[in-house]
Interface confidence: low
């Protein structure tokens, strides 16, 4: 579990020419908030999807009035951050949408009127507890400003907020094979293990022994994808096998959501999937045109020449959704394994394989030493995926291939001084002292500490390591 | 080590035919993309063609295509690039390399005479 | 087709110095951009994917930037290993497509 935060920065005019009208007028003032929308990023979803992650609402900014004939300033903001918690594991991947919304606060029958000023949108790589990330997103003659992170909600820790941290039992030291939690020095890791067989991909523990599923999977493991089409009847009995989610009483019931948008229910509320031409919580807001640059990253907006008609936008190649906001982003679908770096060619997807991994998707993991050779006489050490070289001496860097200075590691001991040599190096030393790094010290009766003296070796003389 | 090895250039007359071949060591050359770039004397880099790693998929530069054909042998470790109907401005030294997209590993080339 | 070019062609530079190379794209490519080194009589040499990640090995004083259509190569002092031709390289499209290289010589 955590939260996901966002902060606002600025909204304003964008940079070039035809900066936009000033959203508010003398006669009509009005105050700015916003709406964030998240998803997870792991799967090609409709744009119109509900915000499975979680949405939330600023409060109102301040109210605004024009000034005649002043450009269009960055206008003031809401205080605070918006928040979105998350129940769930963190999915490091996500798209997010955010709206910058004007409430006119001029003699309106029925209250203030909202309307939809700005929409921009996009698809984020984020670890939790990592720090502020900047972004800067246009949406036609507007600029949004802002910065996001996500942090985990204790006792969760890491970049996906599934590791439990606990405080210590005992001062000193964690429990055998536990580790401190890093920034929680003085807590443990819990040892977290899923039931067994708990799908890594769909499932994960926040307790050891249980198996808890992320939106769409289910089944004791987590491995049986939902469908709602294989129910008998809409009320009728779970089965875990075909996977039939049965909802109970819901947010939806009714259809809260006006103007024919569907409405689908979020592990916390209630999305609205609005026609073209309709914005809002509920769709209850109308009016968005072509003059309004409702087609992001390159859409060509066609029709909507009035409030009552609709708009089409199309996208360019690599976006889709109604207004061409979503990345098409095929690697969202992490399908390079063991770490593997995915490339979307247009034509296939490529997997670039983590050293010791190899395969299409990287799925093969390699003998660590294979093919690999250690130049001057070092030997190949298998570990983690990757290889390494324990040099001879004299020799260095990850193949064994760099001339080491022997006396770099100050070997002599005992104040012993150090000699680079062709076969290695020599040790001189200090009077009291013998052995090859000097290491024995010589007892004062003239004995060493060695068991035998090697014949015809003097206390003091070099000695050569080879 | 990954290795690249090319072999098969060397001078034709144009409208004649050769065959690279390029022999991989050092990696699991079934499980790579592999590509063909190419550079003629004193110019720059031009990518020729490449092929998936069942040899499923092939890709072309347009002054190529319909004359030069790219295959492979995963059981072999080998790649191949017949060339026919030669021209005088395919006279370079051709390269094979292992495909990202990017290639990070190269060959020392085979050079490829078209002359009359 | 994207057209990729790179500026300078040729540069004169010290050792010692900071060096920057510049690759433009006819439009936007996002991120996928390498970047390769070749000595003369030699193959190129793999030193940057995805615009900025270091390949593993390549000294660290080499490092890539940009995104969309304007990218830069950039050698933080240049030492004489570095005199070479330096080619970009967009990849994410169905015919790989190299900028002309720029040559950087000894002053």
């Known amino acids: 579990a955590g939260v996901f935060e966002l902060q606002i920065h600025s909204f304003g005019p964008g940079p070039g020419p035809g900066a936009p009208r000033s959203p508010c007028s003398a006669r009509l003032p009005c105050r700015l908030f916003f709406r964030v929308c998240l998803k997870p990023g792991l799967s090609e979803e409709a744009a119109e999807s509900p915000c499975a992650l979680g949405a939330a609402l600023s409060a109102r900014g301040p109210v605004y009035t024009e000034q005649p004939g002043a450009p269009a300033p960055d206008l003031p903001l809401p205080d605070g951050l918006l928040q979105v918690p998350f129940r769930d594991a963190w999915p490091g991947t996500f798209s997010f949408i955010i709206e910058t919304w004007r409430e006119e606060l001029g003699d309106q029958i029925g209250g203030p009127a909202w309307s939809l000023l700005a929409r921009v949108a996009g698809r984020r790589r984020l670890a939790a507890g990592g720090p502020w990330a900047r972004d800067i997103q246009r949406a036609g003659a507007w600029e949004l400003r802002f910065s996001y992170r996500a942090r985990c909600e204790p006792p969760a820790v890491g970049t996906a907020c599934t590791r439990l941290c606990r405080p210590r039992s005992a001062p000193s030291r964690c429990g055998p094979g536990l580790r401190p939690c890093a920034p929680l020095e003085d807590e443990c890791e819990a040892p977290l293990v899923c039931r067994a067989g708990c799908s890594p991909e769909h499932g994960f523990c926040e307790q050891p022994g249980e198996c808890r599923c992320l939106e769409g999977w289910t089944g004791p493991l987590c491995t049986v994808p939902v469908s709602t089409s294989s129910c008998l009847s809409p009320r009728g009995p779970s089965s875990a096998t075909t996977g039939c989610l049965v909802p109970g009483p819901g947010p939806c019931d009714g259809n809260p959501c006006a103007n024919g948008g569907s409405c689908s229910e979020t592990p916390r509320s209630f999305e609205c999937t609005c026609p073209r031409g309709f914005y809002g919580l509920r769709c209850e807001v109308s009016g968005v045109t072509c003059a309004d640059g409702p087609c992001f990253n390159g859409g060509l907006c066609v029709g909507g020449a009035d409030p009552d008609s609709a708009y089409i936008c199309h996208c360019p190649p690599g976006f889709q959704g109604s207004n061409c906001e979503k990345r098409v982003d095929r690697c969202s679908l992490q399908p390079c394994r063991n770490g593997g770096l995915c490339l979307d060619l247009g034509h296939a997807l490529r997997c670039r394989c983590r050293a010791g991994f190899a395969g299409p998707r990287c799925e093969h993991d390699l003998d660590d030493c294979a093919g690999r050779a250690c130049a001057n006489g070092g030997t190949c050490v298998e570990g983690g995926g990757a290889h390494r070289c324990s040099c001879a001496l004299g020799f260095g860097g990850r193949d064994c291939r760099e001339r080491a200075d022997p006396c770099a590691a100050r070997p002599c001991a005992h104040g012993g001084r150090c000699y680079a040599h062709f076969s290695g190096l020599v040790c001189a030393c200090a009077p009291g002292y013998m052995g090859a790094r000097c290491e024995f010290p010589v007892h004062p009766d003239g004995a060493s500490a060695l068991p035998a003296a090697p014949p015809g070796l003097r206390p003091g003389d070099p000695q050569r390591y080879l | 080590e990954v290795h690249l090895v090319e072999s098969g250039g060397g001078l034709v007359q144009p409208g004649g035919s050769l065959r690279l071949s390029c022999a991989a060591s050092?990696?699991?050359?079934?499980?790579?993309?592999m590509t063909w770039v190419r550079q003629a004397p004193g110019k720059g880099l031009e990518w020729v063609a490449n092929i998936k790693e069942d040899g499923s998929e092939k890709y072309y530069v347009d002054s190529v295509k319909g004359r030069f054909t790219i295959s492979r042998d995963n059981a072999k470790n080998s790649l191949y690039l017949q060339m026919n109907s030669l021209r005088a401005e395919d006279t370079a030294l051709y390269y094979c390399?292992?495909?990202?997209?990017?290639?990070?590993?190269w060959g020392q080339g085979t050079l490829v005479t078209v002359s009359s | 087709d994207i057209q990729m070019t790179q500026s300078p062609s040729t540069l004169s530079a010290s050792v010692g110095d900071r060096v920057t190379i510049t690759c433009r794209a006819s439009?936007?490519?996002?991120?996928?951009l390498a970047w390769y080194q070749q000595k003369p009589g030699k193959a190129p040499k793999f030193l940057i994917y995805?615009?900025?990640s270091l390949e593993s090995g390549v000294p660290s004083r080499f490092s890539g930037s940009g995104s969309g259509t304007e990218f830069t190569l950039t050698i933080s002092s240049l030492q004489p290993a570095d005199f070479a031709t330096y080619y970009c390289q967009l990849y994410n499209s169905y015919s790989p497509t190299f900028g002309q290289g720029t040559k950087v010589e000894i002053k």
């Open positions: 995805r615009a900025s």
């Open positions: 050092g990696f699991t050359f079934s499980s790579y993309w």
């Open positions: 439009q936007s490519v996002s991120d996928w």
């Open positions: 390399a292992r495909d990202w997209g990017y290639f990070d590993y």
